[in-house]
């Protein structure tokens, strides 16, 4: 039994780090493998993660953490019974993938303005809470070419756009994702999408 693709890990900078790797053949990850992780710090102890299958030879492990600060560094040991398959380390602050925003809502009752709001996925005491920026994706269900991205570079989790920038009388969907420049994070996963019917009063033409 050998590791084909070494574990790579990302942290949500809150309570979970996710590590993925591939074995050299079909593996029952949960029964054959264990990933031990330990914070490099005085009096810390090793903790065990039981991996799950992620495709035939792929494994994924969700490492539970109490919280994360920038200095944290973890040792990782991948075991198959008594055999050490791989040894490495992981610094969560250098491999951050933020949590996806939630509760995306489209408010269509504000005259001819669309107000999109969503929730910051972090509690106020988390460092990322005040450092997230967002990308909002809006697309038409009817027209694959009608696909647009709005970058929200301010902290407030909301976006206002004129309803008239979209076509009237058709359905749109929106989703949002987040990233944090301070830790040069990857983008989060997209939030679940929300659907609405876009309609607005066309302005009377002046002759």
């Amino acid at each position: 039994m050998k590791v084909l693709q070494e574990p790579t890990c990302v942290s949500d900078y809150m309570s979970i780090s996710t590590c993925e790797w591939k074995m050299n053949g079909p593996t029952n990850c949960s029964t054959e493998l264990r990933l031990l992780y330990q914070l490099v710090f005085l009096l810390s102890e090793a903790h065990t993660c039981i991996p799950e299958n992620n495709g035939g030879a792929g494994c994924v492990c969700h490492l539970l953490m109490d919280d994360v600060v920038s200095a944290d560094n973890y040792t990782l040991d991948l075991w198959a019974g008594q055999q050490l398959l791989w040894k490495g380390s992981f610094k969560p602050s250098e491999h951050v993938k933020p949590r996806a925003p939630g509760n995306l809502t489209v408010h269509t009752n504000v005259s001819d303005t669309l107000l999109l709001t969503w929730s910051n996925p972090y509690p106020p005491d988390n460092y990322l809470y005040n450092h997230l920026t967002y990308a909002v994706n809006i697309w038409s269900e009817n027209d694959p070419a009608d696909f647009r991205i709005y970058n929200v570079t301010y902290l407030e989790p909301s976006l206002r756009i004129a309803a008239s920038t979209l076509k009237s009388g058709i359905s749109y969907r929106a989703r949002v994702r987040a990233w944090a420049q301070c830790y040069n994070t990857t983008w989060s996963e997209w939030s679940p999408s929300t659907k609405w019917h876009n309609s607005y009063r066309e302005p009377f033409e002046q002759h």
Epitope: L39, L42, L43, D66, D67, V69, Y127
Partner: antibody, heavy 125, light 112 residues
Framework: EVQLVESGGGLEQPGGSLRLSCAGS????????MTWVRQAPGKGLEWVSS????????YYADSVKGRFTISRDNSKNTLYLQMNSLRAEDTAVYYC??????????????????WGQGTTVTVSS | DIVMTQSPLSLPVTPGEPASISCRSS???????????LDWYLQKSGQSPQLLIY???NRASGVPDRFSGSGSGTDFTLKISRVEAEDVGFYYC?????????FGQGTKLEIK
């Protein structure tokens, strides 16, 4: 009530051995690291040794390394300090103290928040 | 080893007056944001030490709010807003960022 009670101190000749015990109660003993601190007569506090909750990690002051052994029996909620090759400079009051929570991934630290009453070790010929 | 230096070593105070003790470390005790591994302990005559402040500024359970801790990195301070007669004893700072844990020499607080 969270409590630590030391025992095992006494008078011992140089080169001799003693085993100190510290019985914990009122908290989940195995979840916490434990620490020994000593105080020579008329002197300040000196750290001696620490051990993690499971006992897998141990740490010693240079002055006792190779002579003292810290251990624990979590089934008995008891911490130990085996003291061998005793020297006159080991004469002190020995305190055990409750250290950080090591059951968590990050050892949660709340200071040495509970101390025993101390047990006196005298090394003299 | 990290060396801890306290000042003053003796502190005579009138009851009701404030008191302040300084503690300096030879290396930073800041592990990361919000985690300064510096504690303050009080040892009254004939008693075991008792925890006053942990992680530089967190008051331990049951400690009166006249005690406060501050500082970060290498410079720390323990303040008593209004000294009471029961506050007499030796005050020690201690670092627990790394082993060996090291203590300051101790500050003897006495009533004038």
């Amino acid at each position: 009530e969270v409590q630590l009670v030391e025992s095992g101190g006494g008078l011992e000749q140089p080169g001799g051995s003693l085993r100190l015990s510290c019985a914990g109660s009122g908290f989940t003993f195995r979840d916490y690291a434990m620490t020994w601190v000593r105080q020579a007569p008329g002197k300040g506090l000196e750290w001696v040794s620490s051990i993690s909750g499971s006992g897998s990690n141990t740490y010693y002051a240079d002055s006792v390394k190779g002579r003292f052994t810290i251990s624990r029996d979590n089934s008995k909620n008891t911490l130990y300090l085996q003291m061998n090759s005793l020297r006159a400079e080991d004469t002190a009051v020995y305190y055990c103290a409750k250290d950080r929570l090591t059951a968590s991934v990050r050892p949660n630290y709340y200071g040495l928040d509970v101390w025993g009453q101390g047990t006196t070790v005298t090394v003299s010929s | 080893d990290i060396v801890m230096t306290q000042s003053p070593l003796s502190l005579p105070v009138t009851p009701g007056e404030p008191a302040s003790i300084s503690c300096r470390s030879s290396q930073s005790l800041l592990y990361s944001e919000g985690y300064n591994y510096l504690d303050w302990y009080l040892q009254k005559s004939g008693q075991s030490p008792q925890l006053l402040i942990y992680l530089a500024s967190n008051r331990a359970s049951g400690v009166p709010d006249r005690f406060s801790g501050s500082g970060s990195g290498t410079d720390f301070t323990l303040k008593i807003s209004r000294v009471e007669a029961e506050d007499v004893g030796f005050y020690y700072c201690m670092q627990s960022l790394t082993t060996p844990y090291t203590f300051g020499q101790g500050t003897k607080l006495e009533i004038k």
